[in-house]
Interface confidence: medium
Amino acid sequence: AYRPSETLCGGELVDTLQFVCGDRGFYFSRPASRVSRRSRGIVEECCFRSCDLALLETYCATPAKSE
């Protein structure tokens, strides 16, 4: 069986973000107020190195109050 590298790029990254964020949308770079390493975006954190579900979740959008 294929051994996963634990990195996410391209379409796989988008697909997994849709799973983690549940269709509420996501950012490729978090708003400055939510990020400690301001220069990094999700591609650098999850495509160039490995990341987990908790880190992916920090890129989910938090829309204005729902209907």
Partner: antibody
Amino acid sequence: QVELVESGGGLVQPGGSLRLSCAASGFTWSSFAMSWVRQAPGKGLEWVSYISYLGSYTGYADSVKGRFTISRDNSKNTLYLQMNSLRAEDTAVYYCARGTKFDYWGQGTLVTVSS
Amino acid sequence: DIVLTQPPSVSGAPGQRVTISCTGSSSNIGTYDVHWYQQLPGTAPKLLIYSNSKRPSGVPDRFSGSKSGTSASLAITGLQSEDEADYYCSITRVFGGGTKLTVLG
């Protein structure tokens, strides 16, 4: 039509190991992420693990992290779940489910962990 | 952690309308899409409603879903005996506790 068929369940002692398989047909296998979801006897559904469509990424529920490993073989259209250090609370029917919305499910395979 | 709360059971007579609620908080149901699954006795779950209110092909229009604020609902009209099953709501990888629907009579 879409078909998912799980196998590999059975009776195993606490601390033992088991590998589940899920054979897929009827859709473009390598285009879909897959998950394992389990259901303890008489209980509700619990998501266990996720793997992205190329197999590059995996995610796990806290209850199985470090003990279970999900993988896929895109040349065989098959999903796997390697379960180690099994506990009594892992006793459940294990289902494989397609995609990010779990739009198709297999029939399930029963895993019983008991001495 | 995300928690989704469903009533353990609901019941109705054939032909009636029943609703099943799924309650969370503004940080989950308020922002995520909700999916519903039907599990007939002794069978695997089946996707019934996705993205709050959309029906997969083959699901009768007697089944409908809605979402408002921190709660989602599944409505079944024209209740039939074959609707007797367990129903689960979910958002992403978290499931509600399930609701057993009993069709009376």
